[in-house]
């Protein structure tokens, strides 16, 4: 669920290659699937399968596509406007303490507990105590990486295409 975007994720572009389409920014922003040129005059398309941008933006670089790890399946490929969608393989899930890898789901509940939730790509099987109904399950965490920026960005009117 969390966005993990750091400086390494930014994919530097070479000077616009012939296959990279250019267009003009609209009120300082480029549409999804593009980034802005250093001089701010052009919108340069992201490279299909290599990098992407999801929103209208003034990014100098598109964002690098995620590669699915072993133990993950690719639900949809990276496009110029969408990152790769990866998911843990069947029988595994992403654990709170180690979101970077898929872990095997438990095969059953401890004695005195009953299963009320199945193994999913984002949670282990869910068990509850027969008497109390207290839950035991895993959850997907929210991980954030800070990118430094200057405080107090001035107000700006909304920008969009004509």
């Amino acid at each position: 669920e969390s966005a993990l975007i750091t400086q390494q994720d930014l994919a530097p572009q070479q000077r616009a290659a012939p296959q990279q389409k250019r267009s003009s920014p609209s009120e300082g922003l480029c549409p999804p699937g593009h980034h802005i040129s250093e001089d701010g005059r052009d919108c340069i398309s992201c490279k299909y399968g290599q990098d992407y941008s999801t929103h209208w933006n003034d990014l100098l670089f598109c964002l690098r596509c995620t590669r699915c790890d072993s133990g993950e399946v690719e639900l949809s490929p990276c496009t110029t406007t969408r990152n790769t969608v990866c998911q843990c393989e069947e029988g595994t899930f992403r654990e709170e303490d180690s979101p970077e890898m898929c872990r095997k789901c438990r095969t059953g509940c401890p004695r005195g507990m009953v299963k009320v939730g199945d193994c999913t790509p984002w949670s282990d099987i869910e068990c509850v105590h027969k008497e109390s109904g207290t839950k035991h399950s895993g959850e997907v965490p929210a991980v954030e990486e800070t990118v430094t920026s200057s405080p107090g960005t001035p107000a700006s009117p909304c920008s969009l295409s004509g």
């Epitope: 300082g28 999804p32 929103h55 209208w56 933006n57 964002l63 969408r82 800070t146």
Partner: antibody, heavy 122, light 107 residues
Framework: QVQLQESGPGLVKPSQTLSLTCSVS??????????WSWIRQHPGKGLEWIGY???????YCNPSLKSRVTISVDTSKNQFSLKLSSVTAADTAVYYC??????????????WGQGILVTVSS | DIQMTQSPSSVSASVGDRVTITCRAS??????LAWYQQKPGKAPKFLIF???SFQSGVPSRFSGSGSGTDFTLTISSLQPEDFATYYC?????????FGQGTKVEIK
């Protein structure tokens, strides 16, 4: 866990400017990959997306409101704000701030603030 | 703008019932659709993202499916806490747009 809270006047006079602030706690507004949105809900009606701001200050808004909307961010206070000018009774709504995950694999609004009812009336 | 149309606008059901809500987009949005649940006086709460079936912390009785223009949210066995209004939202293009909502009421 990131939490959002809206603040501002609950009553605004017609033709004036509605001003709201969203305070973010439990995480930095400067975290890359998140877009910070405003969404409103007219009484008994559905949801309308107003616009978003990135920590860099770039904004994008719903064309239906574009000319009246200004969104700003103050990373030192971990806040972002909405200004809606020339309000009328039609702008009476519950205003929500929400985080939009821009990672590209997942794209939904979560979490949301609790909402603030703004009534436009003289 | 992409118009999102939900049906029915309201549905009366009993605890244990299977409930299906439909959301239709005015143009194709691939699988980029989210579902939210809203209870009176509260903010909407994210439920499911169809492109990945992601629903962390959401009971498994909720499921979302569909692609292109037609989508469904299914509650396999309605529980007392599920009585609420449900909204779909397209995340394919800007501006982001929501369906008008489907209210699930107690029969």
């Amino acid at each position: 866990q990131v939490q959002l809270q809206e603040s501002g006047p609950g009553l605004v006079k017609p033709s004036q400017t509605l001003s709201l602030t969203c305070s973010v706690s439990g995480g930095s507004i400067s975290s890359g990959g998140y877009y910070w949105s405003w969404i409103r809900q007219h009484p008994g009606k559905g949801l309308e997306w107003i616009g978003y701001i990135y920590y860099s200050g770039s904004t994008y808004c719903n064309p239906s409101l574009k000319s009246r909307v200004t969104i700003s961010v103050d990373t030192s206070k971990n806040q972002f704000s909405l200004k809606l000018s020339s309000v009328t009774a039609a702008d009476t709504a519950v205003y929500y701030c929400a985080r939009d995950n821009g990672s590209g694999s997942y794209d939904w609004f979560d979490p949301w603030g609790q909402g603030i009812l703004v009534t436009v009336s003289s | 703008d992409i118009q999102m149309t939900q049906s029915p606008s309201s549905v009366s059901a009993s605890v244990g019932d299977r409930v299906t809500i439909t959301c239709r987009a005015s143009q194709g949005i691939s699988s980029w659709l989210a579902w939210y649940q809203q209870k009176p006086g509260k903010a909407p709460k994210f439920l499911i993202f169809v492109a990945s079936s992601f629903q962390s912390g959401v009971p498994s009785r909720f499921s979302g499916s569909g692609s292109g223009t037609d989508f469904t949210l299914t509650i396999s066995s309605l529980q007392p806490e599920d009585f609420a209004t449900y909204y779909c939202q397209q995340a394919n293009s800007f501006p982001r747009t929501f369906g008008q909502g489907t209210k699930v009421e107690i029969k």
